[in-house]
């Protein structure tokens, strides 16, 4: 017996689609070997129609695909726009067609529904509207019009022209009699339920001269669209339910076992905690269509999703719906990156954002997720030189290190900066990732003066004190502008005296501005980096004023310590919990730390179940000075 398994028989109708799942033992050889779907010929042999190696027969061009799910030991063949010519015997299998690793599938495609012995067939999707048309003769124009449903052997009255409505149809059915010119009445049923399916009889008049018309109503559950996305990536569900529900509350729910469909998000403001920080419900168009974006996909996000419309904002009988089956590919092209970055108040964070390396020329963006209404993510910075006004001087998006990663540095952190941020580009929408910034207790590592005033035409020296832990890192000063931070020459002034219990490896590095001009006014950052990987930064605002007395200015840290508006910040070094994926070159001396506060926080963003990957400074490494 072959170990391959699948449906023995598949029956469908013309124009429909089928999804044929074939199961195989998920050994490593099987997972990676060729998968195929072939049609058996009359004389034996099996002609390949589609395979996992990219081959698609001309018969299937544009209407079929084959997707392998190695982690499940399955592959799925989707075939759309079926015709009766597709009826036949097929095999789904592994390896070479002529070998025995296959399963026989019979596909039978019958003619689509039409007029059968004077019965009009109505095929309508669940939750939608049907109009059953009922013709009659002139002699019955003034007589009672009615619609019956055949239940078992007996017709049951559904609605009539005298005002009766069957309780099962209350609030969702009406009987319309056309103008005198047309000998037709129609029954409109909204919010169709599965239980509405069946045989109906229209009748005009009640005697032997009555006019009768049979109708067969078929209510279809929506065929789920298969969506296959990468772990840590993004998915967008586009939901078009039609203009008739444009003003009805919309929802996206995820089906759990049994009868429940748990709301993920709806337009009434409900959002599942597991999706906090990583979901947006985009505003609907006039036609009632809307979309839902979920980023930072996790293994447990896989499943069946329904979008729909109902005044309760959740799935109810008769909700018009659309369905998707989301698979999350664990063999992801999107690199593992920290989902939580920790920063000390007054300090900084450096966030690494992945993007599709094939799109190095794309515009990079960073936005702040807001939970209000249906979720939104207003942009804070982009790679084209735009920075939101409130973030000037403390936010920079750098193209470095490049090759699939860009860096965002945010300094002068306050508790208001805690939240969820999204990395995205104007290219591949699947590469949207989410990071949560948490603000923790501690002291910034870098010491800079608070605010500095330079005098026109004079020389200004601004100190930055680096603790010994940064002895092996490159230290720099730069001038912030909205396109980045332009490097400036700086001088190493030897060991710093700003740190207690810190040896000769601490450093004081100064920025010198000679012959200060108005153009020198602005934000300056000192920081550490190694190669193209950025660590902690500290920011100083330099104001420029008219000369009062001659001489040069040398700003000391002591003055800055007394300053009420001192700007300070946290380390951008990355600490990854449980799975240490630190860059060994940059953060060799930092250890992976388990922070129990985050382990216990159920609403925390986490890309990968079972791991909490975090980036940020631990207060254990901060040195205090007085």
């Amino acid at each position: 017996k072959s170990p391959i398994f699948g449906p023995e028989e598949v029956n469908s109708v013309e124009g429909n689609s089928v999804s044929i799942t074939c199961y195989y033992p998920p050994t490593s050889v099987n997972r990676h070997t060729r998968k195929y779907w072939c049609r058996q010929g009359a004389r034996g042999g099996c002609i390949t129609l589609i395979s996992s190696e990219g081959y698609v027969s001309s018969k299937y061009a544009g209407r079929a695909n084959l997707t392998n799910f190695p982690e499940n030991g399955t592959f799925v063949v989707n075939i759309a726009q079926l015709s009766q010519d597709d009826s036949g015997r097929y095999k789904c299998g592994l390896g070479i067609n002529s070998r025995g690793l296959s399963f026989d599938v019979s596909l039978e495609v019958s003619q689509g529904p039409g007029l059968l012995n004077d019965t009009k067939v109505y095929t309508v999707d669940l939750g939608r509207t049907v109009t059953i048309n009922c013709p009659f003769k002139t002699e019955n124009a003034q007589k009672r019009k009615s619609l019956y449903k055949q239940i078992g052997l007996y017709p049951v009255l559904v609605i009539d022209s005298s005002g009766y409505v069957n309780p099962n149809y209350t609030g969702r059915i009406r009987l319309d009699i056309q103008g005198t010119g047309q000998l037709l009445f129609s029954v409109v049923i909204n919010q169709l339920r599965l239980s509405d399916a069946g045989q109906y009889l229209c009748q005009a008049g009640d005697d032997s001269n009555s006019n009768k018309k049979n109708a067969d109503l078929q209510v279809l559950k929506p065929e789920p669209e298969l969506v296959y996305e990468d772990l840590r990536g993004s998915v967008t569900f586009h939901c078009a339910l039609g203009p008739e529900v444009a003003n009805v509350a919309k929802f996206l729910c995820r089906q759990s076992s049994g009868e429940n469909c748990d709301v993920v998000v709806n337009t009434l403001g409900k959002r599942a905690p597991a999706f906090e920080g990583r979901i947006l419900l985009n505003p609907q168009d006039k036609d009632g269509s809307f979309s839902v974006v979920i980023t930072g996909l996790r293994k447990e996000d896989a499943g069946r999703y329904l979008c729909g419309a109902h005044s309760d904002g959740q799935l109810q009988e008769g909700s018009p719906i659309q369905a998707w089956q989301l698979f999350v590919n664990e063999e992801s092209t999107i690199p593992r990156s920290p989902t939580v970055v920790k920063g000390v108040a007054g300090s900084s964070v450096a966030v690494l954002c992945p993007y599709n390396r094939k799109e190095s020329k794309s515009i990079k963006y960073w936005c702040l997720w807001e939970g209000a209404q249906n979720g939104r993510c207003p942009l804070l910075v982009d790679s084209e030189g735009w920075v939101k006004a409130q973030y000037e001087g403390r936010l920079s998006l750098l193209e470095e290190p490049g090759n699939g990663t860009f860096t965002v540095i945010l300094n002068q952190l306050t508790s208001r900066d805690a939240g969820f941020y999204w990395c995205l580009t104007n290219g591949d929408t699947l590469w949207r990732t989410t990071v949560e910034i948490k603000i923790i207790e501690g002291e910034p590592n870098l010491k800079v003066p608070g605010n500095v005033t330079a005098v026109l035409g004079e020389t200004l020296k601004v100190p930055c004190h680096f603790p010994c832990k940064f002895s092996s890192y490159e230290k720099y000063w730069c001038k912030w502008n909205n396109t980045g931070c332009q490097a400036l020459p700086s001088q190493d002034e030897g060991p710093s005296k700003a740190f207690v219990n810190c040896d000769e490896n601490s450093r004081l590095v100064s920025l010198t501005l000679n012959l200060v001009t108005r153009a020198d006014e602005g934000w300056y950052w000192c920081g550490v980096k190694q190669g193209h990987f950025y660590g902690e930064t500290a920011a100083v605002y330099v104001a420029v004023e008219e000369r009062k007395a001659a001489g040069s200015r040398d700003v000391s840290l002591a003055k800055a310590d007394a300053a009420p508006d001192e700007k300070v910040l946290d380390s951008g070094f990355r600490e990854i919990e449980n799975k240490a994926i630190q860059d060994p070159r940059l953060f060799a001396e930092e250890k992976a730390v388990a922070d129990t506060r985050d382990q216990a926080d159920g609403s925390r963003a986490s890309v990968d179940s079972g791991s909490s990957e975090e980036q940020g400074g631990s207060s254990r490494h901060h040195h205090h000075h007085h």
């Epitope: 398994f5 449906p7 023995e8 028989e9 598949v10 029956n11 469908s12 109708v13 429909n16 689609s17 089928v18 999804s19 044929i20 799942t21 199961y23 799910f69 499940n72 399955t74 799925v76 529904p113 095929t123 339920r193 599965l194 239980s195 078929q218 279809l220 559950k221 929506p222 065929e223 789920p224 298969l226 089906q255 759990s256 076992s257 049994g258 009868e259 429940n260 896989a302 499943g303 069946r304 009988e317 369905a323 089956q325 698979f327």
Partner: nanobody, 130 residues
């Protein structure tokens, strides 16, 4: 409350035929898939056959040990499923259980796995005498 009620079991001669029925009932219950499993004394529950539907498309699955002998079908309303058992053998003797799914699962879930079915009937005994 969803209920699955099996009927049609009984005693049958080797080589004979039997037709089992399973009716699903419950307020607004509309299954998405129904199937049959069987359990012989001292053995694990074994997959026999299943039928899954989506709109006008149906998918029929049959276990290897009964292939070519048993067929599965359903009524037009989709609330009753039938197992036509032909050419029965003594090793077909078992309690036959009906299973149903209200919610379409991840389609990669194997219908042969009893753990992935939501609802179960109480079973009907089939005995094949030689």
């Amino acid at each position: 409350e969803v209920q699955l009620v099996e009927s049609g079991g009984g005693l049958v001669q080797t080589g004979g035929s039997l037709r089992l029925s399973c009716a699903a009932s419950g307020r607004t219950f509309s299954p998405y898939a129904m199937g049959w499993f069987r359990q012989a004394p001292g053995k694990e529950r074994e997959f026999v056959a299943a039928i899954r539907w989506s709109g006008a498309t149906t998918y029929k699955y049959v276990g290897g040990s009964v292939q070519g002998r048993f067929t599965i079908s359903r009524d037009a309303a989709g609330n009753t499923v039938y197992l036509q058992m032909n050419s029965v053998k003594p090793e077909d003797t078992a309690v036959y259980y009906c299973a149903a799914d209200r919610v379409p699962k991840d389609i990669s879930i194997d219908p042969r796995n009893p753990k992935d079915w939501d609802y179960w009937g109480k079973g009907t005994q089939v005995t094949v005498s030689s």
